[in-house]
Amino acid sequence: ELCDDDPPEIPHATFKAMAYKEGTMLNCECKRGFRRIKSGSLYMLCTGNSSHSSWDNQCQCTSSATRNTTKQVTPQPEEQKERKTTEMQSPMQPVDQASLPGHCREPPPWENEATERIYHFVVGQMVYYQCVQGYRALHRGPAESVCKMTHGKTRWTQPQLICTGEMETSQFPGEEKPQASPEGRPESETSCLVTTTDFQIQTEMAATMETSIFTTEYQ
């Protein structure tokens, strides 16, 4: 069962799924100037059995100008470098969570993929929230959201997270911190987790190697 709506929006926070439940679907979206090949899949599907899960179907983009030319699926190194979508294989990915039974890892990028990924989550999916750069997390409880089924309808639990405007970044679990935590501050205060459905997170490496994770809104 697909989750209705989006996960809750938290001011100055963004969300990420660390692993995707079987049944999750990912749109095959292409960047501007490219389109999905006519015979290509509309979605990728997380599928599998109790021991192994993987993504079915491959997304393929072709130039809008040359409609019948299929672009290669594997991105070139320089294209991978330019992509901003956070991937599960990055240092911020806790291996144990990605290896959960019945869950898929972040799918690898495909050539000329759009910069935003659009997921269709299923009941039981958990997402984690973090404050955007320049905001600090104040926890009242779990900074996560779960899609639950109640009385035949789905709902996302409300993450207990407030992001306050102090110039301090917070990280997803397992992600290296761009700077040391201020002395005396508990670790839990500088990491913030939360959950949402349609996941659109992007990462950008600044020249200073400071990592900035944020969601991109449609413009």
Partner: nanobody, 126 residues
């Protein structure tokens, strides 16, 4: 030139039903995802429902799930929104939208839709 034309709106009493239609010209619905959005006075545009042409994914906003049904007649290049058990809070202008890719739903889901109709007014009042 692509055109989407909504029809079927009107005034209905609470608990009543309406069936909205969306006629497309200039594109073929059999390779486009179709969606409905609505906008109430003084409020932001809100996602209502979407369905891709291959019927892989159909999504509804939780506020309408179980009451509204999105359907399509690809051969006739027409989409529909059957609205039952209407409530005063359903009052809005309803827009039909289409895009080449898969379903996009949720809060900020309007922008990825390439084509839009002019809208049809639905008023639920006693």
């Amino acid at each position: 030139q692509v055109q989407l034309q909504e029809s079927g709106g009107g005034l209905v009493q609470p608990g009543g039903s309406l069936r909205l239609s969306c006629a497309a010209s200039g594109i073929t619905f059999n390779d486009h995802t179709m969606a409905w959005f609505r906008q109430a006075p003084g409020k932001e545009r809100e996602f209502v429902a979407a369905r891709d042409w291959s019927d892989i994914i159909t999504r509804y906003a939780s506020s309408v799930k179980g009451r509204f049904t999105i359907s399509r007649d690809n051969a006739g290049n027409t989409g529909f929104l059957q609205m039952n058990s209407l409530r005063p809070e359903d009052t809005a202008v309803y827009y039909c939208a289409a895009r080449e890719g898969g379903v996009v739903a949720g809060v900020r889901s309007g922008a990825p839709y390439d084509y839009w109709g002019q809208g049809t007014q639905v008023t639920v009042s006693s």
